[in-house]
């Protein structure tokens, strides 16, 4: 009878083991052990037991111990099981940005592994288990599907292999993949609205405001405005799932003409995008020409406006004749033309909005200087210890300078309250004098002395 | 304007200053004289109006007279005393100020009282 | 009566400061005020007519404000040609030409 011990064994792979090999016979004609592991006899006292050690131990083995007595042959098995945890655990990779409400494939492989009986493999969302099957195949493959929700949000999946070896006396031995961060995000399928100037003048500033609602996580979403080849620089406000982008825009002459407006949001790897076309266009204010901004009276003016080629311009509220870009009047300058204004107004047609810019100019007339009876009245009667006022106003442009004296040494005081007295009374040479030249008047002051009463 | 007539007289005598005017008439502006002694202030002494119309100063009354003809403005001085010494200015418009074209001033001339 | 009186008699000054002469009318005369100035051998020179309007040439430097019976000549940023002595004169009153002019300032520029 031939024996074995141990008749099972589980070890790691590459290890060794000791195994006996006994029979019941004192003399045994023939006592060993079949194997194709290296193997090394270790010698004991007496002829029915020898003892091996089987080294390298790389697969499940079953060496055979065989005796021959002179009752006959027999043998023996001894199982011998290796354990090895996988080479290799894995998660497809995925890109790691993914919209919410997509159905999400979580693919596990293992290689190797061993026994595979003991071996099962997990998928996991942080510690929460999604799915658990034994390893099967090679490589073996586990495979989830998840429905991406806003708060899987950084969340980590990962797939764990468990070789559990406890029954056999062993531990549970876990291996785990690198971990896939999953980053969800929503993307309207609106594109962006932008709000900006249709038509903008060069060397002006204009602003452009592109916003979008319902983003997920709206402070990643990237967002790009641009103006042709001109690259915007946008201050970015954010709300709980809304941003708005706010850039101030330059243009100058070079970029006369149509513009593409684009603003881009680019969230995960997703995108959206608004086109919109701004017309960009030159448009100086008219100009008003006088012959001369100061004349003196009846001087003939020649007022012109001229504007940009394209436009159409009124000269004081009167259209150009025929309708262009250029119009003009004429007009003997009288004093009541002082001061006035000639406003030119001219109307371009951009991108169909109407564009008008105006220009005004004033003339400046000089006439005078005036004294006339109606402001400087030639009589004055008052009672001798009355306070009066004597007024006298000159009329001219530029204002003329007033003096009234009596025999070029007294002067009345224009204006100033005075108490009348017999000084006071006599003829009063007033002079108006100004760059236009110099006008006389006289004016005569009685004093009715209180005993005429 | 221009003042002539002054230099040495001797007290209790009589002497007229003369001012000459070219450019203006008369008759449309005032002229009035001014006197300054050695070191002293300005003091008016008196004027004549467009109208020939004579005003002095409380001092100057009775020993002081203006007169003119079409060209010319006189001081006649009365019985100088050494007080009178002084340069003695010929002013036009004295009164009137639209600017400094009115107040045209003789360069002066000296008048010195001593016996 | 309409007497001029001027303060101060004399007054001493730093090329680049500022001078005030005040000149007070004995009763108002409105704002008929001349102001002068004489260097020493020369004629008056026409500064300020009207209280406050300055006479043509002359510099923005001088300033001169008031009315009624208070008036001031203000020169401002001095120069050493500014040194001279500076006369007002009421312009209002002919028939009281007594003390027409004020005193006289005395201006000495260091």
């Known amino acids: 009878q031939t024996s074995v011990s141990p008749s099972k064994v589980i070890l790691p792979r590459g290890g060794s083991v000791l195994v006996t090999c006994s029979t019941s016979c004192d003399q045994p004609k023939l006592l060993g052990i079949e194997t194709p592991l290296p193997k090394k006899e270790l010698l004991l006292p007496g002829n029915n037991r020898k003892v091996y050690e089987l080294s390298n131990v790389q697969e499940d083995s079953q060496p055979m111990c065989y005796s021959n007595c002179p009752d006959g042959q027999s043998t023996a098995k001894t199982f011998l099981t290796v354990y090895w945890t996988p080479e290799r655990v894995e998660l497809a990779p995925l890109p790691s940005w993914q919209p919410v409400g997509k159905n999400l494939t979580l693919r596990c492989q293992v290689e190797g592994g061993a026994p595979r009986a003991n071996l099962t493999v997990v998928l996991l969302r942080g510690e929460k288990e999604l799915k658990r099957e034994p390893a099967v195949g090679e490589p073996a493959e586990v495979t989830t599907t998840v429905l991406v929700r806003r708060d899987h949000h950084g969340a980590n999946f990962s797939c764990r292999t468990e070789l559990d070896l406890r029954p056999q006396g062993l531990e549970l031995f876990e291996n785990t993949s690198a971990p896939y961060q999953l980053q969800t995000f929503v993307l309207p399928a609106t594109p962006p609205q932008l709000v900006s100037p249709r038509v903008l003048e060069v060397d002006t500033q204009g602003t452009v405001v592109c916003s979008l609602d319902g983003l997920f996580p709206v402070s990643e979403a990237q967002v790009h405005l641009a103006l042709g080849d001109q690259r915007l620089n946008p201050t970015v406000t954010y709300g709980n799932d809304s941003f708005s982008a706010k850039a101030s825009v330059s243009v100058t002459a070079e970029d006369e003409g149509t513009q593409r407006l684009t603003c881009a949001v680019i969230l995960g790897n997703q995108s959206q995008e608004t086109l919109q076309t701004v017309t960009i266009y030159s448009f100086p204010a008219p100009n008003v020409i006088l012959t001369k901004p100061e004349v003196s009276e009846g001087t003939e003016v020649t007022v012109k406006c001229e504007a940009h080629p394209r436009a159409k311009v009124t000269l004081n509220g009167v259209p150009a004749q025929p309708l262009g870009p250029r119009a003009q009047l004429l007009l003997k300058a009288t004093p009541e033309d002082n001061g006035r204004s000639f406003s030119c107004s001219a109307t371009l047609e951009v991108a169909g909005q109407l564009i008008h810019k105006n220009q005004t100019r004033e003339l400046r007339v000089l006439y005078g200087p005036r004294l006339d009876e109606r402001d400087c009245p030639g009589n004055w009667t008052w009672p001798e210890n009355s306070q009066q006022t004597p007024m006298c106003q000159a009329w001219g442009n530029p204002l003329p300078e007033l003096k009234c004296l009596k025999d070029g040494t007294f002067p009345l005081p224009i204006g100033e309250s005075v108490t009348v007295t017999r000084d006071l009374e006599g003829t009063y040479l007033c002079r108006a004098r100004s760059t236009q030249g110099e006008v006389t008047r006289k004016v005569t002051v009685n004093v009715l002395s209180p005993r005429y009463e | 304007v221009e003042e002539s007539g002054g230099g040495l007289v001797k007290p209790g005598g009589t002497l007229t200053l003369t001012c000459t005017v070219s450019g203006f008439s008369l008759s449309t502006h005032a002229m009035g004289w001014v006197r300054q002694a050695p070191g002293k202030g300005l003091e008016y002494i008196g004027i004549i109006g467009s109208s020939d119309r004579t005003y002095y100063a409380s001092w100057a009354k009775g020993r002081f007279t203006i007169s003119k003809t079409s060209t010319t403005v006189d001081l006649k001085i009365t019985s100088p005393t050494t007080e009178d010494t002084a340069t003695y200015f010929c002013v036009r418009d004295p009164y009137d100020s639209f600017d400094d074209g009115y107040r045209l001033w003789g360069p002066g001339t000296l008048v010195t009282v001593s016996s | 009566a309409y007497d001029m009186t001027q303060t101060p008699a004399s007054v001493e000054v730093a090329v680049g400061g500022t001078v005030t002469i005040k000149c007070q009318a004995s009763?108002?005369?409105?704002?008929?005020l001349s102001w002068y100035q004489q260097k020493p051998g020369q004629r008056p020179k026409f500064l300020i007519y009207?209280?406050?309007k300055v006479a043509s040439g002359v510099p923005s430097r001088f300033k001169g404000s008031g009315s009624g019976t208070e008036f001031t000549l203000t020169i401002s940023a001095v120069q050493s040609d500014d040194a001279a002595t500076y006369y007002c004169q009421q312009a209002y009153s002919s028939s009281n030409v007594d003390n027409a002019f004020g005193g006289g300032t005395e201006v000495m520029v260091k």
């Open positions: 009207d209280a406050s």
């Open positions: 009763q108002s005369i409105y704002s008929y």
